[in-house]
């Protein structure tokens, strides 16, 4: 299906607004220093470019491939060097070295000041008077903030910015409306944000093979009525859609997620009951549905997998003839019956079958040989079951922020190198775990709990590569995707770290803590118990809640007082001094 | 070894009601489906309900809003309430667990529906 201009193609395929807003986080997430200005101008003049070509097809340069269009108008940027430094050198490069080259600057943590929320009739104002312009803004500082944020997701959001916007400005009480909208987009933005990342993770640092299997697991999950064959088409073509958003290909990306929703919605039969409601909303609502669609019903009276998989003679015959079909086959069966199962334990088992037949089909008695091979399942499916259990417990008995703060500590101790802020954020994130998971009834908890850990160990994966600092969290990270998770959880106290030197510094407070809202008070003594953690690894449970506890009333008390700094001052020192006692 | 003990079959009336039970012991994870077949005389094993792990129910279109199947997690538990009872539900009901490497039966239990 070639096409003389491929930019003409895109353009008449998406629409004009949906083309200038994906280049738009094209560019943002290439770039993501350079001033909104820059890039609209960019947009401008590559939309400006795409309608020539619309028009006629053959004109100048219409017949360059996405890349180059782009790459050239990219590198066009005159402060590249100086803002950029040796992402420059990118520009030197042919395509597809060149946007290669572009893929691999992306920065996971760029060095952008925190969003901040304008008053609301500031924005309302804003909106008002340049609506189309306040959206740009709105895809702008989230793609670059996120640079592999699922670009047609990204514009569903802000499909549902405007429409918060465009009502809530309108409403007798605007904040009220409105703040609760932008609170659940900016929550819902942060998850898709990564779990979009660990998609892309998969694919680029262990190949498609990995995202195919993950696609066959939650989609059989999914859709346990459909047959192997339509799940293997919907996870080929997923597995197109999210190589091109995580190669940058965002046009090609957005344009098959909608062919996708298209066949989805033409073949529900065949497919899933639960599609019908999404398959009549409009396409950005229509494709987001079918991502998020829960799992249908299982079909009533399958059997155990124990004829085709360990008592049928052909076992080995069937695996030599087409492994990855085979082994497919198996998933797909095992994961349609276990919508209770974390897809990376499904994953686990798939793994732990495929070893189990490479070693048995070379063995004398093969059949013997594997007999067994579901009865080896038993100590992978109790482990994860028994870690949910334990952790729903603690975050039971200890609520949400404690339960965070326990896990700070058994994390900072596993890997004691990381920096505060990576081990406070993901540790923060860990803990989140309790209030999404623990709630849900028994058969929904380990996929929840353990997929979700899967994306906030992801985010700590990624935000280590680009500072190594551990050999251990390098060694969890490479070794094995699905493995990801025990590996952290097997973690010890890292005994061959040298306690960090005390700095009083680090724990000394100023009033400025007592205007800080919850949430930034709970991090700043989140910051204090990890470097407290990292002085003293060795700390009991009971020390540092004893340290804890006497932060928080030295906290309280100043900011009770009628001079605070003058309390934070004389009270600091004393604290300190209290807390080195305790913890000696 | 798994076994599964049926129980809370007997004579019943047209119209009455019973509860069967059935209990496994011994070492039985990841189960998938629990289910109640029964089997008439001189006729084929049917499937009466089943539940499956996510919580979903199916019924034999002839016991639809008379019989209801629930499951104890906990205890490795399957339930079958049978309500209006007629003289055609007359059959051995068997309960059947599987996980993935098995389905495991019980021996059966004798409902007898007379006047």
């Known amino acids: 299906d070639t096409h003389k201009s491929e930019v003409a193609h895109r353009f008449k395929d998406l629409g004009e607004e949906h083309f200038k807003g994906l280049v738009l986080v094209a560019f943002s997430q290439y770039l993501q220093q350079c001033p909104f200005e820059e890039h609209v101008k960019l947009v401008n003049e590559v939309t400006e470019f795409a309608k020539t070509c619309v028009a006629d097809e053959s004109a100048e340069n219409c017949d360059k491939s996405l890349h180059t269009l782009f790459g050239d108008k990219l590198c066009t940027v005159a402060t590249l060097r100086e803002t950029y430094g040796e992402m420059a050198d990118c520009c030197a490069k042919q395509e597809p070295e060149r946007n290669e080259c572009f893929l691999q600057h992306k920065d996971d943590n760029p060095n952008l000041p925190p969003l901040v929320r304008p008053e609301v009739d500031v924005m309302c104002t804003a909106f008002h008077d340049n609506e189309a312009t306040f959206l740009k803004k709105y895809l702008y500082e989230v793609a670059r903030r996120h640079p592999y944020f699922y670009a047609p997701e990204l514009l569903f959001f802000a499909a549902r910015y405007k429409a918060a916007f465009a009502e809530c400005c309108q409403a007798a009480d605007k904040a009220a409306c409105l703040l609760p909208k932008l609170d659940e987009l900016r929550d819902e933005g942060k998850a898709s944000s990564a779990k979009q990342r660990l998609k892309c993770a998969s694919l680029q640092k262990f190949g498609d093979r990995a995202f195919k299997a993950w696609a066959v697991a939650r989609l059989s999950q999914k859709f346990p009525k459909a047959e192997f064959a339509e799940v293997s088409k919907l996870v080929t073509d997923l597995t197109k859609v999210h190589t091109e958003c995580c190669h940058g290909d965002l046009l090609e990306c957005a344009d098959d997620r909608a062919d996708l929703a298209k066949y989805m919605c033409e073949n529900q039969d065949s497919i899933s009951s639960k599609l019908k409601e999404c398959c009549d909303k409009p396409l950005l609502e229509k494709s987001h549905c079918l991502a998020e669609v829960e799992n249908d019903e299982m079909p009533a009276d399958l059997p155990s997998l124990a004829a085709d998989y360990v008592e049928s003679k052909d076992v080995c015959k069937n695996y030599a003839e087409a492994k990855d079909v085979f082994l497919g086959m198996f998933l797909y069966e095992y994961a349609r019956r276990h919508p209770d199962y974390s897809v990376m334990l499904l994953l686990r088992l798939a793994k732990a079958y495929e070893a189990t037949l490479e070693k048995c089909c070379a063995a004398a008695d093969p059949h013997e040989c594997y007999a067994k091979v579901f009865d080896e399942f038993q100590p992978l499916v109790e482990e994860p079951q028994n870690l949910v259990k334990q952790n729903c417990e603690l975050f039971e008995q200890l609520g949400e922020y404690k339960f965070q703060n326990a896990l700070l500590v058994r994390y900072t101790k596993k890997v004691p190198q990381v920096s505060t802020p990576t081990l406070v954020e993901v540790s923060r994130n860990l803990g989140k775990v309790g209030a999404k998971c623990c709630k849900l009834p028994e058969a929904k908890r380990m996929p929840c709990a353990e997929d979700y850990l899967s994306v906030v160990l992801n985010r700590l994966c990624v935000l280590h590569e680009k500072t190594p600092v551990s050999e251990k969290v390098t060694k969890c990270c490479t070794e094995s995707l699905v493995n990801r998770r025990p590996c952290f959880s097997a973690l010890e106290l890292d005994e061959a770290y040298v306690p960090k030197a005390f700095n009083a510094e680090t724990f000394t407070f100023h009033a400025d803590m007592c205007t800080l809202s919850e949430k930034e008070k709970q991090v700043k003594k989140q910051t204090a118990l990890v470097e407290l953690v990292k002085h003293k690894p060795k700390a009991t449970k009971e020390q540092l809640k004893g340290v804890m506890d006497n932060f928080a009333a030295f906290v309280e008390k100043c900011c009770k007082a009628d001079d605070k700094e003058a309390c934070f001052a004389e009270e600091g020192p004393k604290f300190v001094a209290a807390s080195q006692a305790a913890l000696a | 070894q798994v076994q599964l003990v049926e129980s809370g079959g007997g004579l019943v009336q047209p119209g009455g009601s019973l509860r069967l039970s059935c209990s496994a012991s011994g070492s039985i994870w990841g189960i998938y489906h629990m289910g109640w077949y029964r089997q008439a005389p001189g006729k084929q094993r049917e499937l009466v309900a089943s539940?499956?792990?996510?919580?979903?129910?199916h019924y034999a279109d002839t016991v639809k809003g008379r019989f209801t199947i629930s499951r104890d997690n906990s205890k490795n538990m399957v339930y079958l309430q049978m309500n209006s009872l007629e003289p055609e539900d007359t059959a051995v009901y068997y309960c059947d667990i599987r996980n993935v490497g098995g389905d495991y039966w019980g021996q059966g239990t004798q409902v007898t529906v007379s006047s």
């Open positions: 539940i499956t792990v996510d919580g979903s129910t």
